[in-house]
Interface confidence: low
């Protein structure tokens, strides 16, 4: 079978348009377009338009779709662990008698040993082993700032537990910030959530290797169980390649609409409800940029292929190591519409209607 | 071309295995497997195993991959807005002189009007218009609980702004809970984040339609700008279908491994590094369940097809309205590995290696 057959672009567009006809009706669970007999004349009511706009704002403001992974995310991440500075260190002295918080300090030079440059860091987690506890408590994590202030990072509601359990906090931003500074001691504060009214702001949660009164309860605290940072980073030697010529492109509208890419890419397609589907029943919008994915994803591996030539192509053409990679949507966005059911205008949101980028999968 | 040709399953598996060979080397940026000449004899060092296990724990504990969308998410959502109970209502009396918080109450019967049954609610957002402000403040949102207590919902760091701006909080869980209870007035509390040490716990952020001293600064507060709930829900009549016989299945290992599904599904494939790839250089794990996607996604729309027959199939076979839908991975998981570079053991995490579920895209 030749893979070089010409693509009839018009046929593909026609098929996509007809598929969209079915998709919209199916999402609305309509067997056919609704009758427009009772639709009142004149423009849409102001309240309906306001509601439609609110829905559009949401789409613009906080699309929950995952971003396409950056090139570096495709490659393997080296995993290392950096233990908290030992509790005997003088830096802990000032924090001794504070009942609402416990502190964990880390040496930036240890972190830099594992992650020589900030952009190489892919993920950093703070791992704490919480001892068994019979109380529920809302806790917060803060990052130490230079001028002795603390920046809020996140919170967790901890329910009672009969056994020790590991907690994990994503502290990638904080660690990347430390790496952007010189070396030194940096830290986290793990606190009770102090409410505006409550008088009891004591931290009841105990952390292995920190909580002072439990210091000896497991004999010498085993290093493996004291707080540590779990770091995932692109090794320095691997990072050099990321700045070489062969980049993994985002196959999105920015790139695809302005290039003559023959391989997998997002292709422009505007659907005009009246012209393309012969529909007058959707009152807003008049149409939308549906787009579609098209183009080959060459299968680029066989036993007789020379390894080194092929490896650089993997990231773009077959990152998921599929037996027959396929050009499919990656980032999708919803579409709000306004239509009438009888005399009643409805605002509805249709999920995954607009193709923003494609990928070989 | 006949789409009924028999699939040579062994050939597909072979292609997937060879693709994985390239994928792993490419992710590690290796042109060929590393030499094992200097690898020290004996088991892996304990610290390396502990690190490998930490990485595996992370994968088990908090995979960041999005869940496959439930069937209901495919269908259109009706959008409605429910305004906050008017500030003149007696319920606000008790909350007048509290400086750290402002309160917003909603009538559950108004919400139920829009969402007659809790499971129909897809998303609820609390929208507040914040007035211009020159201060930065960390704020929190709480949900009213029956016994006059408050449950923490979320927080936001608000930076200074020269113009009014809309804030949006996801309150789906809270609203669903209210719908599960009887009718009545329910509310949210919007508070300053009260720190354990700080004495100034005053809320400096002002919300249009609430903050008392600004009550008249825009003339009569325009209804459109007072706090409201933006609700997205499956209409009742559409929901009946979700309980009918034809479900959209999750094409995951639970379903696919135990069925004889001919169409798109995840297929079982265990890769043994030694047997399948002839590799001895990966020390942990010995192999992994890579799996793969296979099976047709029939294109199910044409002008002469009878609408109603086809609509029910859309959700399963071509939810993205593709011109040529394709069976591709949906949920993927990473794989941590241990291997040696010279005498040095390395723990690395490879992204998107294990196929957990598939979809037609």
């Amino acid at each position: 079978l030749s893979t070089c057959k010409t693509i009839d672009m018009e046929l593909v567009k026609r098929k996509r348009i007809e598929a969209i006809r079915g998709q919209i009706l199916s999402k609305l669970r309509l067997a056919s377009p609704p009758s427009q007999g009772e639709v009142p004349p004149g423009p849409l009511p102001e309240a309906v338009l306001a509601l439609y706009n609110s829905t559009r704002d949401r789409v613009a403001g906080e699309s929950a779709d995952p971003e396409p992974e950056p090139e570096a995310d495709y490659y393997a991440k080296e995993v290392t662990r950096v233990l908290m500075v030992d509790r005997n260190n003088a830096i802990y002295e000032k924090t001794k008698d504070i009942s609402h918080s416990i502190y964990m300090f880390f040496n930036t030079s240890d972190i830099r040993e594992a992650v020589p440059e900030p952009p190489l860091l892919s993920r950093a987690e703070l791992r704490l082993q919480r001892l068994k506890s019979s109380v529920e408590q809302h806790v917060e994590l803060y990052q130490k700032y230079s001028n002795n202030s603390w920046r809020y990072l996140g919170n967790r509601l901890l329910t009672p537990t009969d056994t020790p359990e590991w907690l994990s906090f994503d502290v990638t931003g904080a660690v990347r910030q430390w790496l952007n500074q010189g070396d030194g001691i940096q830290g986290f504060r793990f606190s009770a959530h102090c409410s505006c009214d409550s008088k009891d702001n004591k931290l009841h949660v105990e952390i292995n290797g920190i909580s002072p009164k439990r210091r000896g309860d497991l004999g010498t605290i085993h290093d493996m169980n004291r707080p540590f940072l779990l770091l995932m980073a692109t090794p320095l030697e691997r990072a050099q390649h990321l700045h070489s010529s062969r980049h993994r492109r985002a196959l999105d509208t920015n790139y695809c609409f302005s290039s003559t890419e023959k391989n997998c890419c997002v292709r422009q397609l505007y659907i005009d409800f009246r012209k393309d589907l012969g529909w007058k029943w959707i009152h807003e919008p008049k149409g939308y940029h549906a787009n579609f994915c098209l183009g080959p994803c060459p299968y680029i591996w066989s036993l007789d292929t020379q390894y080194s030539k092929v490896l650089a192509l993997y990231n773009q053409h077959n990152p998921g190591a599929s037996a027959s990679p396929c050009c499919v949507p990656q980032a999708l966005e919803p579409l709000p519409i306004v239509y009438y059911v009888g005399r009643k205008p409805k605002v509805e949101q249709l999920s995954n209607m607009i193709v923003r980028s494609c990928k070989c999968s | 071309l006949s789409t009924c040709k028999t699939i040579d399953m062994e050939l597909v598996k072979r292609k997937r295995i060879e693709a994985i060979r390239g994928q792993i080397l490419s992710k590690l940026r290796l042109a060929s497997p590393p030499s094992q000449g200097e690898v020290p004899p004996g088991p892996l060092p304990e610290a390396v195993l502990a690190l490998y296990n930490s990485t595996r724990d992370r994968v088990a504990g908090e995979s960041a991959d999005p869940e496959p969308e439930p069937e209901a998410d495919y269908y259109a959502k009706e959008v409605t807005r429910v305004l906050m109970v008017d500030r003149n209502n007696a319920i606000y009396e008790k909350t007048k002189d509290i400086s750290h918080s402002i309160y917003m109450f909603f009538n559950t019967s108004d919400i139920r009007e829009a969402v007659p049954e809790p499971p129909l609610l897809s998303r609820a957002e609390l929208r507040l218009q914040r007035l211009k402000s020159s201060v930065e403040q960390h704020v929190e949102l709480y949900q009213k609980y029956s016994n006059n207590s408050w449950r923490y919902l979320g927080n936001r760091l608000l930076t200074p702004t020269d113009t009014p701006e809309w804030l949006s909080f996801d309150v789906t869980g809270a609203v669903r809970q209210w719908l599960n209870q009887g009718d009545g007035i329910q509310g949210f509390r919007f508070s300053a984040h009260c720190s354990c040490d700080s004495k100034d716990n005053k809320l400096h952020v002002e919300i249009n339609g609430i903050s008392p001293k600004r009550r008249g600064d825009l003339g009569t507060i325009h209804d459109m700008n007072r706090p409201f709930l933006l609700l997205m829900a499956t209409p009742l009549e559409r929901a009946q279908h979700l309980h009918s016989s034809r479900h959209r299945r999750a094409l995951d290992t639970n379903y696919c491994f135990s069925s004889t599904e001919k169409n798109c599904c995840v297929r079982q494939l265990y890769i043994d590094f030694r047997k399948d790839l002839g590799w001895k250089w990966i020390h942990e794990p010995k192999g992994y369940h890579a799996n793969f996607c296979l099976g047709p996604c029939p294109y199910i729309w044409s002008l002469d097809t009878q609408y109603s027959k086809v609509l029910a199939l859309y959700n399963q076979h071509n939810p993205g309205a593709s011109a040529s839908p394709c069976c591709v991975p949906q949920a993927l998981e990473p794989l941590p590995i241990v291997y040696y570079v010279g005498r040095k053991p390395k723990v690395e995490q490879l992204s998107n290696m294990i196929v957990r579920s598939c979809k037609c895209s």
């Epitope: 020589p116 440059e117 230079s146 001028n147 001691i185 940096q186 | -």
Partner: antibody
Amino acid sequence: EVQLVESGGGLVQPGGSLRLSCAASGFTFSNYGVHWVRQAPGKGLEWVSHISAAGISRYYADAVKGRFTMSRDNGKNTLYLQMNGLKSEDTAVYYCAKDRIRSSYEYDSWGQGTQVTVSS
Amino acid sequence: LPVLTQLSSMSGSPGQTVTITCTGSSSNIGGGYYLSWYQQLPGTAPKLLIYNANNRASGVPNRFSGSKSGNLASLTITGLQAEDEADYYCGCYDSSLSTGYVFGGGTKLTVL
């Protein structure tokens, strides 16, 4: 023996450009962050810029931000400082210096310096 | 004005002990960042004497020592010699500045 040798200095008019180079030898250049530090006549030391080992991260003093660009060629073991829009206050001896470890901002080896004079 | 403060000049006789100080803040010295001391002999490039506040660089005589307490760092020279006459600079990373690194104004040490 570690050696850093600067070149490319000279006399230039205000608004003009110069490109300084620093040739490194005696150590694995691609493993270390490197910095430019300058010293105006009769004045103290002033940090100018830093580039990390792989050339991924670059940092500049406020006084030169937007005008100076630091780069490196690890294949040629050479560091560069492209200086545009020069001002009279940029007149100084420019030193390149290497980090003691990775990006520690401790300079264990310095070049002999190259003189840059900005004058009309 | 330099963020790290040093006395502009000091003097001492041969054999004496002198201490040069460098005062900073919690965003540099007090923040635990690497602090270094450099010696610049007349007409030459600077040379690293002390790194990480109290470690002697290779080849530096043990007459030179460094210490740090809070926001204050000190360089002590015991048994002062004529060849120690030079400018001495402290340097440290500063997290509050976008510039990143700062040097003290320098101390001119004269051996009488």
